[in-house]
């Protein structure tokens, strides 16, 4: 069978009614029946995905190919998608059910792994309405959300979560740090109804709150007031110079005075060195630039403050979280260094099943996977110390070759006469 | 944070090329994005490309396509722009600006705008 | 392509609210850039992604977007915020900038 499964909305309103799961929040009726799964591949039937998944129709793009890389926990269960050249775009997509998640959680989920050591490159999805030509995805095409880890360089490493909100794409203001090791990790964002939202990594929250609050998808709730500006007598200096503090007579002295010690030379000729005139030193006396004493401004009244006002443009919105339409899930990505694996994607709104997912899929396989890692290391290690030590006994070798040629060369004896000279000489 | 350093003032003739450079320096060149920005006396700020050195690949506007490259030398962290076939409307102060690189996408650093500038090059084209 | 509207010139009294706008066709869809560039100086970002103030630019400077406007605004001006100002938009990859606004401060 394949490994997309797409279910619908789940039980009939009547189930629902009767199971007594109703709640009510700001107007929006929803509910946690069955669990709808809109989307799921774990691309486990082989050279199936190809029949479900759209590519770019644009030669320089880069290939996905099917892969569990080098390694991992399961061969089979841990193949996914995986870039294979670099430095390129790539695009690639997958349609299904088109479905609204107004009323109701989203969960978006899927594995990552970047066992290329990446550099620049691209962990994230985005989920498309079913109006998009799936042949010409690119970078520049509308989305409802885009979800995932992102990494370029030093300064990028990062859960990007976005929204498409009126046309326009809005990105979090809170720094979500993403996982950069070579092992596969698991992403989850949860959307709800009542406009908070979740982020979790290996099933863990990361970061959580409400979507008003960490997007700007609404304009401020307060404003300067544009008609308040400062009055002109506003005094905003809380020290000012002592109107009765007058400079002493005595304060203004020069800075450098005549040294009294110096003496003319006794061979000065004023003829020739013209007028004589002693080194100039500086004046003890000298008190420098003088400054009225500081009193508290009697006419003080602190910093002014722009008074603010409700903002007229400001009205809440509790839709923020739905979209009329999912219908596409894709892959629009540049990767520098290629090699990163995606699997196990699911979209479903229920909260409970997504993360049971996660367990059997990524829970099941990270600690064979991190074994054979290890193993692969200490294999590298080991070969690496043979080579070392095959490299040192080459060295040693030729030094010994070198030396041979270079001393000179001695009568050969025989053993036996050797032996002997030996017996002899002791 | 970066600073741009770009070399000094041109006198070119009609029909020629200029190449002007653009030094990066107290950041990691990797980091960001170089976009180049003209302004012809007396007018506003017009856009002629940019590039991202860890991708090494630049885009330009349609007006100046097949008249400017764009490229970056990573390992001095030096941007350039060249700008062939001069004509007199190519007089301008010619400036290179930097955008943090916050992700794997050419969009990404242009969320951000262009918040270091480098001090702007003169090139004069005269017959 | 895309296009960027911006008046010419705006003027405002020392202390009062100064407001610059920049016209394009549902500009709420796009992230929202501003600069200002005083004489003979390069450009100084001083609004990125339709409000947001880098580090080092005075509270006085907000911004706002939505419908087919942007709006830069500085209240309480002062005379040192005398200069043109560039809004600035990224569409169909590619930078586009507005014509640029002098403001005058008066008096």
């Known amino acids: 069978s394949s490994s997309l499964e797409v279910l619908f909305q789940g039980p009939g309103l009547n189930d629902i009614f009767e199971a007594q799961k109703i709640e009510w929040h700001e107007e929006n009726l929803y509910f946690q029946g069955e669990p709808a799964v809109y989307f799921k591949e774990q691309f486990l039937d082989g050279d199936g995905w190809t029949s479900r998944w759209i590519e770019k129709h644009k030669s320089d793009f880069g290939k996905f190919v099917l892969s569990s890389g080098k390694f991992y926990g399961d061969e089979e269960k841990d193949k996914g998608l995986q870039t294979s050249q670099d430095a390129r775009f790539y695009a690639l997509s997958a349609s299904f059910e088109p479905f609204s998640n107004k009323g109701q959680t989203l969960v978006v989920q899927f594995t990552v792994k970047h066992e290329q050591n990446i550099d620049c490159g691209g962990g994230y999805v985005k989920l498309f309405p079913n109006s998009l030509d799936q042949t010409d995805m690119h970078g520049d095409s509308e989305y409802n959300i885009m979800f995932g880890p992102d990494i370029c360089g030093p300064g990028t490493k990062k859960v990007h979560v976005i929204f498409n909100y009126k046309g326009k794409n809005v990105l979090i203001n809170k720094d979500i740090r993403c996982k950069d090791d070579e092992f596969t990790h698991l992403y989850t964002l949860i959307v709800r109804p009542d406009n908070t939202y979740e982020v979790k990594i290996d099933n863990s929250q990361v970061e959580s709150g409400s979507l008003e609050d960490d997007w700007d998808f609404l304009p401020p709730k307060k404003i300067k007031d544009p008609d308040a500006s400062k009055p002109e007598d506003w005094d905003e200096r809380a020290k000012i110079d002592d109107p009765t503090d007058s400079k002493p007579e005595d304060w203004d002295k020069p800075e450098h005075i005549p040294d009294p010690d110096a003496k003319k030379p006794e061979d000065w000729d004023e003829e020739m060195d013209g007028e004589w005139e002693p080194p100039v030193i500086q004046n003890p006396e000298y008190k420098g630039e003088w400054k009225p004493r500081q009193i508290d401004n009697p006419d003080y009244k602190g910093t002014w403050i722009h008074p603010e006002i409700d903002n007229p443009e400001y009205s809440p919105d509790p839709s923020i979280y739905a979209y009329d339409n999912f219908g596409v899930l894709g892959l629009d990505l540049w990767q520098v260094k290629s090699g990163t694996i995606f699997d196990n994607f699911l979209i479903t709104n229920d909260e409970a099943y997504a993360e049971e997912f996660g367990n059997e899929t990524w829970g099941v396989t990270k600690a064979a996977e991190k074994q054979m890692k290890d193993k692969q290391d200490e294999e590298q290690r080991t070969r690496r110390m043979m080579r070392t030590k095959m490299r040192m006994r080459r060295m040693r070798r030729t030094r010994r070759k070198m030396r041979r040629k270079m001393s000179p060369a001695r009568p050969r004896t025989s053993c036996r006469e050797a032996c002997l000279q030996g017996w002899t000489e002791a | 944070e970066v600073q741009l350093v770009q070399s000094g003032a041109e006198v070119k003739k009609p029909g020629s090329s200029v190449k002007v450079s653009c030094k990066a320096s107290g950041g990691t060149f990797s980091s960001y994005a170089i976009s180049w920005v003209r302004q012809a006396p007396g007018q506003g700020l017009e856009w002629m490309g940019g590039?991202?050195?860890?991708?090494?690949?630049?885009n330009y506007a349609q007006k100046f396509q097949g008249r400017v490259t764009i490229t970056a030398d990573e390992s001095t962290s030096t941007a350039y722009m060249e700008l062939s076939s001069l004509r007199s409307e190519d007089t301008a102060v010619y400036y290179c600006?930097?955008?943090?690189?916050?992700?794997?996408?050419?969009?990404?650093?242009?969320?951000?705008?262009?918040?270091?500038w480098g001090q702007g090059t003169t090139v004069t084209v005269s017959s | 392509s895309y296009v960027l509207t911006q008046p010419p010139s705006v003027s405002a009294a020392p202390g009062k609210t100064a407001r610059i706008s920049c016209g394009g066709n549902?500009?709420?869809?796009?992230?929202v850039h501003w600069y200002q560039q005083k004489a003979g100086q390069a450009p100084v970002l001083v609004i990125y992604q339709d409000s947001k103030r880098p580090s080092g630019i005075p509270e006085r400077f907000s911004g706002s977007n939505s419908g087919n406007t942007a709006t830069l605004t500085i209240s309480g001006t002062q005379a040192m915020d005398e200069a043109d100002y560039y809004c600035?938009?990224?569409?169909?990859?590619?930078?586009?900038f507005g014509g640029g606004t002098k403001l005058t401060v008066l008096g």
């Open positions: 600035q938009a990224w569409d169909s990859n590619t930078v586009v």
């Open positions: 549902n500009i709420r869809s796009k992230s």
């Open positions: 590039i991202i050195p860890i991708f090494g690949t630049a």
């Open positions: 600006a930097s955008s943090p690189l916050r992700g794997s996408g050419w969009y990404w650093h242009y969320y951000y705008g262009m918040d270091v």
